[in-house]
């Protein structure tokens, strides 16, 4: 088992989270754009990206990964084989998803999201000249990266990448692909070494991790599911958190349980951690709610607000737990505890 240290991750501003959410929506929207619009949007993204690069956190490991991805993307853009490209893009998509769970500032997440969307868009462009143009833009972007803080470390990385880039340009196509795969392997290793504050496919927000279920359970079973993984059916502590969660729920158009009920005493709403519902939170009830029609004792996200409903109904749910601040121990390749009395023979 991996040791879990109480969260020491500083809270981010709601404005940054709004930017991050908007970018996620933007990424989804790009799939619907025509080629011409897509290209225009790529140029806009590049402009924003250049500006954002100047604000990168001074975390050399993250910067290194960011730069490797930039170089990798440029190299991938030059490859001719469609099937190979698809495989590489799948690999990078996984990496992007993994990197997206890192606890660094929203600005970093924003940059990674832009890169993901940008790369997806570049991969769909048919014209070689357009790709060449974008490649040049990315080259200029890389030059900007060289001017980032932590000069000595950054310069060292930048020089190494410049050398690699030059080497890639001189290689035949097959060797180029080989180098990209090696680069991917190193990149995966780098991602693995970084601290991940949230479990797989959980969402990080302001020092907490959230599991948005894709299946449905009644309210009590939802509590049990969360407890099993050391989490809690979500207890909302701030307006920012409420806005974040409401957005998640309304965007997916789902009725979603939260950890709030008046099961103990009719009309007295209480969170599952025992805390009362503060008066300032009552504004989040939908108009006319809670109405207790037919023993409705459990609260859900419904549309743009809250509703009370029957606790035995199956709905989606959200678990919440503090993000981890990990001191990573050396991991073994496999570290199993058998479900059966004895492990399989080694």
């Amino acid at each position: 088992q991996v040791s879990k240290v109480p969260s020491s991750i500083s809270q981010e501003q709601s404005r940054q989270d709004a930017i991050y959410q908007n970018l996620t929506q933007l990424k989804a929207a790009v799939g619907e754009l025509s080629e011409k619009s897509k290209l225009q949007e790529i140029y806009q993204e590049l402009t924003q990206l250049k500006a954002a690069v100047g604000e990168l956190p001074e975390k050399s490991k993250l910067q290194e990964i960011y730069q490797e991805l930039t170089r990798l993307k440029a190299a991938v853009g030059e490859l001719p084989e469609k099937s190979k490209l698809q495989e590489i893009y799948q690999e990078l998509t996984w990496l992007k998803a993994a990197v997206g769970e890192l606890p660094e500032k929203s600005k970093m997440q924003e940059i990674y999201q832009e890169l993901t969307r940008l790369k997806a868009a570049v991969g769909e462009l048919p014209e070689k000249s357009k790709q060449q143009e974008i490649y040049q833009e990315l080259t200029r972007l890389k030059a900007a990266v060289g001017e980032l803080p932590e000069k000595s470390k950054q310069q060292e990385i930048y020089q190494e990448l410049t050398r690699l880039k030059a080497a890639v340009g001189e290689l035949p196509e097959k060797s180029k692909q080989q180098e990209i795969y090696q680069e991917l392997t190193q990149l995966k290793a780098a991602v693995e070494r970084l601290c991940h504050p949230c479990p797989w496919e959980w969402t990080f927000f302001q020092g907490n991790c959230y599991f948005m279920s894709n299946s449905q359970r009644n309210w009590h079973d939802s509590i049990t599911a969360c407890k099993e993984v050391g989490a809690q059916l979500v207890v909302i502590k701030s307006a920012e958190e409420q806005n974040f969660l409401q957005l998640q729920s309304s965007r997916s158009n789902r009725f979603t349980w939260m950890g709030l009920s008046d099961l103990n005493q009719e009309g007295t709403w209480q969170w599952v951690d025992g805390s009362p519902l503060l008066p300032s939170f009552k504004q989040y009830w939908n108009r006319g709610e809670p109405n207790n029609v037919g023993e409705e004792d459990c609260a859900e996200f419904s549309g743009n607000g809250w509703n009370d409903d029957k606790c035995n109904l199956a709905k989606f749910w959200i678990c919440k737990k503090s993000a981890a601040s990990c001191s990573r121990d050396e991991e073994q390749f496999l570290s199993p505890a058998p479900a059966t009395p004895n492990p399989p023979p080694a």
């Epitope: 088992q1 991996v2 879990k4 996984w94 998803a97 993994a98 769970e101 991602v191 693995e192 991940h196 479990p199 797989w200 496919e201 599991f211 279920s213 894709n214 299946s215 049990t224 599911a225 099993e228 993984v229 050391g230 678990c319 981890a324 991991e331 390749f333 496999l334 570290s335 199993p336 505890a337 058998p338 479900a339």
Partner: nanobody, 121 residues
């Protein structure tokens, strides 16, 4: 009590296909990463593939990439491994494994009793 029951193994010719299944119980399946581990005769354990709780993130060992596909059906508490273009070196006992919640890496904290896959002409 965590239980993982694999099925679908058997004898198949090189180039053939098999689909392994793993029925899970005793834990909230929908909240955990899951994966497959294999052990060839006389060899050590080899990690094969891993999938996130929602099935959005998948990860494969280089030796099976492009040939094997991991998937899950959370409504049935079942994990799958579709194995295509099978080779003699894929011969092994395949174990279904419950992933460690907090790890992105190839860690598993429970596994089943295994199902034997033999690739031979």
């Amino acid at each position: 009590e965590v239980q993982l029951l694999e099925s679908g193994g058997g004898l198949v010719q090189p180039g053939g296909s098999l689909r392994l299944s793993c029925a899970a119980s005793g834990f909230t399946f929908v909240m955990y990463p899951m994966g497959w581990v294999r052990q060839a005769p006389g060899k050590g354990l080899e990690w094969v593939s891993k999938i996130g709780p929602h099935g959005r993130l998948t990860y494969y060992a280089d030796s099976v990439k492009g040939r094997f596909t991991i998937s899950r059906d959370n409504s049935k508490n079942t994990l799958y491994l579709q194995m295509n273009s099978l080779r003699a070196e894929d011969t092994a006992v395949y174990y279904c494994a419950k992933g460690n919640l907090w790890e992105m890496s190839r860690r598993f904290d429970y596994w089943g009793q295994g199902t034997l896959v033999t690739v031979s002409s």
